[in-house]
């Protein structure tokens, strides 16, 4: 039986201080758990590296917008 209650929570404790080019980004997910000390975004790069970023930063918001738009474009 799935043990969702005790599922591990991923948190970000530090944010990247470098702006990442959107061409290097493949996806993102939001950390919204109240168990985490910071609201955060985890970007996954095209080489599958995960990077914590601050959702308050403009470049982070713009990158999320860019990735969102890609989800409505059919992959050919």
């Amino acid at each position: 039986q799935p043990d969702a209650i005790n599922a591990p929570v991923t948190c970000c404790y530090n944010f990247t201080n470098r702006k990442i080019s959107v061409q290097r980004l493949a996806s993102y997910r939001r950390i919204t758990s109240s168990k985490c000390p910071k609201e955060a975004v985890i970007f996954k790069t095209i080489v599958a590296k995960e990077i914590c970023a601050d959702p308050k930063q403009k470049w982070v918001q713009d990158s999320m917008d860019h990735l969102d738009k890609q989800t409505q474009t059919p992959k050919t």
Epitope: R29, T32, E39, K56, Q61, M64, T71
Partner: nanobody, 123 residues
């Protein structure tokens, strides 16, 4: 946690206009894609419109395109839906939603929802 409160619903005659507002509180408003959805009696909840975090991109369902306009004010933590040329088919409960996860118009990518506001269009 993001709290969303809708207002502006009501009863209007066909051809009339309404302006729905959604006030957000809690976490960083500008870091969420915002959307409006609606649910008519006995029907599934359906996507109406969305606006990107920057406000630079909007997207509408075919049924409201050209009649509804979505906008946002990140300084005031609000998103509005201007609804013109209303039709009886627009009658529904309208929900404001904040999209945290990667996606577009899919309801499953919106983590936070308001309680909804009733819009009734009479013929």
């Amino acid at each position: 946690e993001v709290q969303l409160v809708e207002s502006g619903g009501g009863l209007v005659q066909a051809g009339g206009s309404l302006r729905l507002s959604c006030a957000a509180s809690g976490r960083t408003f500008s870091s969420y894609r915002m959307g409006w959805f609606r649910q008519a009696p006995e029907k599934e909840r359906e996507f109406v419109a969305l606006i990107s975090r920057s406000g630079g991109t909007t997207f509408y369902s075919n049924s409201v395109k050209g009649r509804f306009t979505i906008s946002r004010d990140n300084a005031k933590n609000t998103v509005t839906l201007q609804m013109n040329s209303l039709e009886p088919e627009d009658t529904a409960v309208y929900y404001c939603a904040a999209g945290a996860q990667m996606g577009w118009a899919e309801a499953s990518t919106y983590d936070y929802w308001g309680q909804g506001t009733q819009v009734t269009v009479s013929s």
